[in-house]
Interface confidence: medium
């Protein structure tokens, strides 16, 4: 039970006090007791419960006409059962007794009031009255946890606006309200109570720029909501009528968790006694609600796809047809960014990452806009953000970034359990240098900090700086699987490719050509590839780099070798000894449920079939996956990217609720 104030009683004159239902009020009967008195008794109105404990050891007893010794070891506490109809209508009488004096009486007039700030602390999507419920001043994780949740109101319900909803002080309509969390203030007081008392709603100054609270006028249009707390207003005096009254507030978060903001916001209601104009306002009671701002959550390839994004560029019609067919098979919406909007920037994967935020009452997709800011710079903010589609960005918006800040370098694993620790929403994966040095690249610290601060998908740093572009999607992917952990990790594998080519040569196919059918591309015989010492050395280095990540992924995702599939792939080292794919990089695939859009490798054709395609199909089809090989050679591959780099996917949010996990 919440702690109320301390009330001192004195025989000289009656004491008047307020007691808030649901709180425990202490009664100081000793400090002003008559000198000669050695014991006391208490009588109270039926609406008041008095508890007397004398310790140690504590003997606890509800009052009757018994007398108690008057010593500091006696604790007297009051609670009230019902709210008062009129001021001071509940009475407590203390009688003091001494050996030689007649009894001395002290009177206490109590006013019982109901004041409670309620939010959805049980995470059911509904606000329930919180009397006799757990303490709402703490926020706890897990299925038995409690605490309310706020969404950053980062969508744009007003299509005429260029800003996010949380960037203004207005409630646009009921759509805008649904992105907010309801908080209700319930009061029950005597009619004249607020002539001498005031309620103040407030937020800590350190949190005022992270939240905005609107007060709703019941029964009126939502446009009548007015802002009462926010970046400019840390406190607000409420106009509350006496009697029984409910007041609704709508709360929106303005910032995501980050290094300087753990994501918790406390809203407090304070009851002030303003009866004595000579004295400062005295705090009679406080009630608080703690909200946690919902984190931004990424979705892995194993989540069902809902929408595919790609760019229309010069001469990529065939590529788009293939992606369209794949999207239709997977029953996905398809959004194409036209040439005039992408300004020849085809790398849809690098520009953004689509995740979501979730509260019990609402789930919202949210696009995380990378700071790479090339031709697609405006696409996330102009075309993706909109009604019920949020937006967030981090990192410097003008320079100071590297290729590792593009979101081809940002992936997330499916859910995993690692040495007994569960990651029910998976773990974020991003590429980094192996060791910080003058020429190494790493993801911008602001991005790393943001990803870590979300808490629910603890990031793993992989090593990708060995690649020319430097993105993790150049050597890994995840695909759904019907068995084991529900997925397989796919890793690019030079070892597997050499093994395949060696087998083909042993079977007499050493003359078969790589890149057959590609105009203006020098074709290479299997036997020449196998005898090319420089290429071997290059791929030996690449294999070591991928093995480094293999070990890291096994350890950090709790994987066994049988959870990993090696996809045959060769690389070559270019400027500064950085690697790029020797032929279209098959692991850089588009995963739409069981439908895979894989870069067509143009491998050696043996018995009428590309041996690389055949090998990949033999590895993936037993998992119920359907492989479609997409020709991206001239439009993507020679520009150092593939199918995954050129597409993006919005996926279904997890059914698992993030607040039920324990980070």
């Amino acid at each position: 039970m919440a702690q109320g104030t301390l009330i001192r009683v004195t025989p000289e004159q009656p004491t008047h006090a307020v007691c808030v239902l649901g709180t425990l009020t202490q009664l100081d009967i000793c400090s002003s007791a008559p000198e000669d008195c050695t014991s006391f008794s208490i009588n109270a109105s039926p609406g008041v419960v008095v508890d007397i404990a004398h310790g140690p050891p504590a003997k606890k007893k509800s009052t009757g006409s018994s007398t108690w010794p008057l010593d500091p070891g006696v604790e007297v506490t009051l609670t009230m059962k019902v709210a008062s109809g009129s001021t001071g209508d509940q009475k407590v009488q203390i009688s003091y007794y001494g050996p030689k004096t007649p009894p001395v009486k002290a009177l206490l007039y109590l006013t019982g009031v109901e004041i409670s700030l309620c939010a959805d602390i049980t995470r059911t999507g509904k606000v329930k009255p919180t009397r006799a419920v757990k303490d709402q001043r703490t926020w706890t994780w897990g299925p038995c946890g409690q605490g309310a949740i706020l969404l950053v109101n980062c969508d744009r319900d007003n299509l005429e606006s260029s800003a996010m909803d949380c960037e203004d002080d207005e409630v646009l309509d009921s759509e805008d309200l649904q992105d907010m969390s309801l908080m209700t203030l319930s009061t029950k007081t005597p009619k004249d109570f607020f002539t001498n008392h005031t309620l103040v709603l407030h937020v800590a100054r350190s949190e005022m720029d992270k939240v905005r609270v609107f007060q709703a006028t019941r029964g009126k249009l939502s446009s009548k909501c007015s802002v009462v707390l926010g970046p400019k207003w840390p406190s607000h005096y409420l106009m509350v009528p006496g009697g029984k009254h409910n007041m609704d507030f709508y709360v929106e978060a303005l910032a995501f968790p980050d290094t300087d903001f753990p994501g918790l916001i406390t809203l407090t209601i304070s009851l002030l006694d303003t009866s004595n104009l000579e004295l400062p306002e005295a705090v009679v009671f406080q009630d608080s609600v703690v909200f946690r701002v919902a984190p931004w959550i990424m979705t892995p390839n194993t989540q069902p796809p809902q929408e595919v994004y790609a760019c229309s560029i010069f001469e990529n019609e065939d590529f788009l047809k293939s992606v369209t067919t794949l999207a239709m098979k997977a029953k996905c919406k398809l959004t194409i960014c036209p040439e005039e909007e992408n300004m020849d920037d085809q790398w849809m994967q690098d520009e953004m990452e689509i995740g979501y935020i979730q509260a019990p009452h609402k789930t919202l997709p949210v696009v995380f806009d990378s700071p790479r800011n090339r031709g697609l710079k405006e696409f996330p903010i102009k075309r993706v953000m909109g009604p019920d589609f949020g937006y967030v960005t981090r990192g410097p918006q003008t320079g100071g970034i590297s290729g590792l800040d593009s979101f081809g370098n940002l992936e997330v694993s499916p859910p995993v359990t690692v040495r007994g620790k569960e990651y029910p929403l998976g773990r974020i994966l991003f590429g980094d240098s192996c060791y910080p040095s003058n020429d190494s690249r790493q993801m911008h610290q602001a991005l790393q900090d943001f990803l870590s601060a979300q808490q629910v998908q603890a990031p793993v740093k992989l090593y990708s700086d060995w690649l020319s572009v430097g993105h993790v999607d150049e050597f890994l992917s995840f695909v759904p699987a019907p068995d084991r952990k529900g997925f397989r990790l796919l890793l690019a594998s030079p070892r597997s490719c050499y093994k395949l080519f060696q087998e083909q040569q042993n079977e007499g196919h050493g003359e078969a050509l790589l890149f057959e059918g590609i105009k203006k591309k020098k074709q290479q015989k299997i036997k020449n590839i196998l005898s090319n010492k420089t290429l071997r050395e290059h791929n030996s280095f690449v294999e070591r780099c991928i093995d480094w990540n293999r070990e890291l992924l096994k350890r950090e995702l709790g994987l066994a070798e049988s959870d990993i599939i090696d996809i045959p792939q060769l690389f070559k080292l270019k400027e500064f000894s950085k690697a790029e794919a020797f032929f279209p990089n098959m692991v850089n695939m588009l995963v739409l449920g069981k439908h895979l859009g894989i870069p067509k490798p143009f491998g050696p054709v043996i018995n009428g079939r590309c041996c690389l395609e055949e090998k990949v199909c033999s590895l993936l089809e037993p998992l119920g996956l359907q492989c479609t090989f997409i020709n991206d050679f001239f439009t993507y591959h020679i520009r150092h990217g593939e199918v995954h780099c050129g597409t993006n996917v919005r996926r279904k949010p997890f059914s698992f609720k993030w607040w039920n996990m324990v980070p």
Partner: antibody, heavy 119, light 109 residues
């Protein structure tokens, strides 16, 4: 899990050098970083530096720069730590330890090698 | 370089009691890359916790780690006889300046 076996105890004169070896088995040597950590009598643990054999990158903290050399021989899965210009305060147990991360988080440890510097 | 300060230097407790060991950093530890080790005389140190709160393989769940930024804690919920040892924290985010704390000795009361 990686097993690390270190060379035996050494007694050295001040001003001389010592080279301690660390043989790794039970994993791909290339995929680890190898750190060296020492503990002087009654003192805490002190990181002396490390090497990533795969990239032949060695790193040393300021304190040991120029006096310690860490090397690795991939063919024998062995790492070495050589400390020169020995003084009595270098008397310590020297441990090698492997790391699976970009950072030098020491995961599996060797049994330790006691080096005594005494005239 | 990041300096790690462990407190208390010695903790005298009985088996079954809860042990709380602190590790303070002179500046925030990058990405909460902080580990805890147990060290017994004549043996190699043993990794207990890494990345602030993740238990290493085979470490009993009575060991738990928490904290962020500059303040970190190792908690042993109920001391077993084999837990009496010296405990070190290590930060490994400030490469190449990896540092250990001075250690906390947990001994039998």
């Amino acid at each position: 899990e990686v097993q690390l076996v270190q060379s035996g105890a050494e007694v050295k004169k001040p001003g001389s050098s010592v080279k301690v070896s660390c043989l790794a088995s039970g994993g791909t040597f290339n995929n680890y970083a190898v750190s060296w950590v020492r503990q002087a009598p009654g003192q805490g643990l002190e990181w002396m530096g490390g090497i990533i054999p795969m990239f032949d990158i060695a790193k040393y903290p300021q304190k040991f720069q120029g006096r310690v050399t860490i090397t690795a021989d991939e063919s024998t899965s062995t790492a070495y730590m050589e400390l020169s210009s020995l003084r009595s305060e270098d008397t310590a147990v020297y441990y090698c330890a492997t790391s699976y991360f970009r950072q030098w988080l020491t995961w599996d440890w060797g049994q330790g090698t006691l080096v005594t510097v005494s005239s | 370089e990041i300096v790690l300060t462990q407190s208390p230097a010695t903790l005298s407790l009985s088996p079954g009691q809860r042990a709380t060991l602190s590790c303070g950093a002179s500046q925030p530890v990058s990405s909460n890359y902080l580990a805890w080790f147990q060290h017994k005389p004549g043996l190699a140190p043993r990794l207990l916790i890494y990345d602030t709160s993740i238990r290493a393989t085979g470490v009993p769940d009575r060991f738990s780690g928490s904290g962020s930024g500059t303040d970190f804690t190792l908690t042993i919920s109920g001391l077993e006889p084999e837990d009496f040892a010296v405990y070190y924290c290590q930060q490994y985010g400030g490469s190449p300046q990896i540092t250990f704390g001075g250690g906390t000795k947990v001994d039998i009361k």
